[in-house]
Amino acid sequence: SSNLEGGTKSVTRPTRSSAEITCDLTVINAFYIHWYLHQEGKAPQRLLYYDVSNSKDVLESGLSPGKYYTHTPRRWSWILILRNLIENDSGVYYCATWDRGNPKTHYYKKLFGSGTTLVVTDKQLDADVSPKPTIFLPSIAETKLQKAGTYLCLLEKFFPDVIKIHWQEKKSNTILGSQEGNTMKTNDTYMKFSWLTVPEKSLDKEHRCIVRHENNKNGVDQEIIFPPIKTDVITMDPKDNCSKDANDTLLLQLTNTSA
Amino acid sequence: QKVTQAQSSVSMPVRKAVTLNCLYETSWWSYYIFWYKQLPSKEMIFLIRQGSDEQNAKSGRYSVNFKKAAKSVALTISALQLEDSAKYFCALGDPGGLNTDKLIFGKGTRVTVEPRSQPHTKPSVFVMKNGTNVACLVKEFYPKDIRINLVSSKKITEFDPAIVISPSGKYNAVKLGKYEDSNSVTCSVQHDNKTVHSTDFEVKTDSTDHVKPKETENTKQPSKSCHKPKAIVHTEKVNMMSLTV
C-alpha cells in the first residue's frame, strides 16, 4: 500500500464513548505538549497542556477534570484520550510544542501537529462506509483533439467527509498534479471526485488513484487502477480483465458498445 | 486577552499583494504575535513572528505592519501564488517565554487566490461516461462564470459542478450526474454569452471505435484468482469503455 504523507486523519466515534487522538509531532526533548481544538467558524483554543517530566495534565480553566487525559505509550509519543464524548467535541485536534529555534531567544515559534478530525455522531450508517470508486476514462474527442486525456476518479457513499486523494503512475512514487471537487453531502454520506489530465505520451502508462480514508478496508490506502490506453482508434472484442487493487484483486470489465 | 480578525475572507489575483488585518487586546506590555497558515488538509504552518519590541518582521514574501499603539498587526503576502490559498490565523502569545505558554487565536481569514486578469478563453467540453454516471469535463476557460447543463430526458440525480483553477491559470470544471439514458446524454455550456456543446468536439468515428486499454502484464485474462466485480458494469458510448472498480 502507498503512503499519503501528512494531514487528513479522522476518527469517528459515537456519543458517550471515548476517542484517542495521536500526536504526530516528532520532537525529542519536548518539555510540554499542548492540545488545541479548532471547530469550524471558531478560533482554535487550547484545551490543556501535558507536563512531560511530571506526567501531568494541566487543563484550561472551566474544563471538566476527567474529560481529557494524555497517555504516553512510549517515550516521545503522546495520545490524547477524550472520554464521555458529546457531539460538540467534534472538531480538529492538534498537538503542539514550543520550538526554541535560536537559543538566544526565550522562544521562537509553536509547532503544530498535522491535526486529527474527530467526528462524534450517533447516525446509523451502513456497515461499509468506505469510499466506493467509479472510474472514467478519457473521451476519444479529448485524446484526439487535445493530445491529452483526463482520468476521473469518483468516490461515493463514504463517511466521515475527511478524505485524501492523490494520483501516481504505476511504479512511481511521484505525486502527480491533479484537481478535485469539494466533498459533497449526499443523504447521510459523502461523495468526492478527483481528476488527472495527462499528456498523450503518458496515456500508455497505468495510473493509480490513491485514496486515504478512515474506513478503508484493513486501514490501508485504497488504490484504484486506471489501465493504460491506446489512443489510436481500433475495434475490439469485449473481454474480462484483472487488475490489482492495493487490497484486492478486482475484475475490470471492458464493454463494447455499438450504436 | 482577545484577537480579532474582522475579514472572514478575501480574494486577490496572483502576482498582487494581500493584507490581512488583525487587532488584539492585551494588558501585557511585552508579547509576541504569530501568523499561521492552515492548509485545506488542516495542517497548521508557522509563517512569521512579530515581537512587541521589535521592528516590523519580514520573511520572504511575508511582512508584518505592526502598530503597537493601535494594537494592530497586519500580515502582507506579496506576489501571491495560487498555493497561497488557505486560511490565515493571527495568534497572541503569552509574554512569559515559558514552554507552558498558550496561543490565543483569532477566527482566521480565508484567502482565495484567483487567476490573473486575462483575455477571455472559450472552453473545450467533453463527456465521460460509466454506466449511469456521466461527467462533463469543461477545460481551460476564463472568466469563471459558467453554466454547465447535462442534457437528458431521464435524470436520476445531478451534482453541483466543481470549478477549480487550472495549472495554466484559467479554470477547469466538472459536473457529474446519474441518468437512466446515459448513452444519449450530452453537455452544453454557457460561457461569455455563447453556448458550447460537447458534440462540437466529438470525433466522427465508427460506433465500434474505442479508446482501448493497452495490453500490459497487468491486464490479463481472468483466472480463478479474480474476485467478482464490486459493482455492476454498464455499457456506455463516448469513451467507449466502462470500468467500475
Partner: antibody, heavy 121, light 112 residues
Framework: QVQLQQPGADLVRPGTSVKLSCKAS????????MHWVQQRPGQGLEWIGV????????NYNQKFKGKATLTVDTSSSTAYMQLSSLTSEDSAVYYC??????????????WGQGTTLTVSA | DVVMTQTPLTLSVTVGQPASISCKSS???????????LNWLLQRPGQSPKLLIY???KVESGVPDRFSGSGSGTDFTLKISRVEAEDLGLYYC?????????FGAGTKLELK
C-alpha cells in the same frame, strides 16, 4: 529609455529549430508581459503567444502550439522564442512586444525591431 | 477565434483632410472586468508597429492628438482629424479581450 533588441536576421535550414531572442532594457523586465507576433512577407500581423517573465506563465495561439515555445531568462532580461521543425512557411519577421498588466490595458506599447527569419535549403 | 474586419482595405487621402477607418469584431470586446480591449497600431513602411490607441479611446503618450478612437461592443472607429505625410502606412486594429489575440487585416493609408 525602454528598448527591445532583436537580432536583424537569421537563416536556417528546413527541419531544424531556431531560438529567437529579445533583450529588454530600460524597465523592470518582470513587470511587463512579453508577446511574440509573426508577420509573413506582404501579410498582416498574427499573434503567437505571451509569457509573463515574473512566473513564466504562458498562453499560446492554438495555431502555434507545438511550433513555438516561449521562455525567459530574468537574469539577462531576455525573452526567447524557439521555433521547431521549420519549413519555408515559417519564413517571416518575428516581433517581440511588451504589454502592461491586463488591468492596466494590456496594450503593446513597445515593439522590437523584428528578426527576419529565412528558412531555406 | 474573434475575427476583426477592417474597412476600407485602402484609404487614399489628401494631406490636411480627415480620415476614418472602421473595425468590426465578430463578437463583443467587452471584458468581464468592464473594460473593452481594442487597440489601434500604425506600421510605417519598413518599421515595426507602433501603438496609437488602447482601450478603444485612450491615446498613447507621444501620439498626436489628431488621432482619436471610438466605439463599443463590436464596432470601432479610428479617426485622424487632419492627415499628415508621416501618417502614411498600415493601420491595424487589435483585440485583446479574447484569447487568441487577433489583428485586423490592416488598412493602407496612402496619399492621393
Amino acid at each position: 529609455q525602454v528598448q527591445l533588441q532583436q537580432p536583424g536576421a537569421d537563416l536556417v535550414r528546413p527541419g531544424t529549430s531556431v531560438k529567437l531572442s529579445c533583450k529588454a532594457s530600460g524597465y523592470t523586465f518582470t513587470s511587463y508581459w512579453m508577446h511574440w507576433v509573426q508577420q509573413r512577407p506582404g501579410q498582416g500581423l498574427e499573434w503567437i503567444g505571451v509569457i509573463d517573465p515574473s512566473d513564466s506563465y504562458t498562453n499560446y495561439n492554438q495555431k502555434f502550439k507545438g511550433k513555438a515555445t516561449l521562455t525567459v531568462d530574468t537574469s539577462s532580461s531576455t525573452a526567447y522564442m524557439q521555433l521547431s521543425s521549420l519549413t519555408s512557411e515559417d519564413s517571416a519577421v518575428y516581433y517581440c512586444a511588451r504589454s502592461d498588466d491586463y488591468d492596466e490595458g494590456y496594450f503593446f506599447d513597445q515593439w522590437g525591431q523584428g528578426t527576419t527569419l529565412t528558412v531555406s535549403a | 477565434d474573434v475575427v476583426m474586419t477592417q474597412t476600407p482595405l485602402t484609404l487614399s487621402v489628401t494631406v490636411g483632410q480627415p480620415a476614418s477607418i472602421s473595425c468590426k469584431s465578430s463578437q463583443s470586446l467587452l471584458h468581464s472586468n468592464g473594460k473593452t480591449y481594442l487597440n489601434w497600431l500604425l506600421q510605417r513602411p519598413g518599421q515595426s508597429p507602433k501603438l496609437l490607441i488602447y482601450l478603444v479611446s485612450k491615446v498613447e503618450s507621444g501620439v498626436p492628438d489628431r488621432f482619436s478612437g471610438s466605439g463599443s461592443g463590436t464596432d470601432f472607429t479610428l479617426k485622424i482629424s487632419r492627415v499628415e505625410a508621416e501618417d502614411l502606412g498600415l493601420y491595424y486594429c487589435l483585440q485583446v479581450t479574447h484569447f487568441p489575440l487577433t489583428f485586423g487585416a490592416g488598412t493602407k493609408l496612402e496619399l492621393k
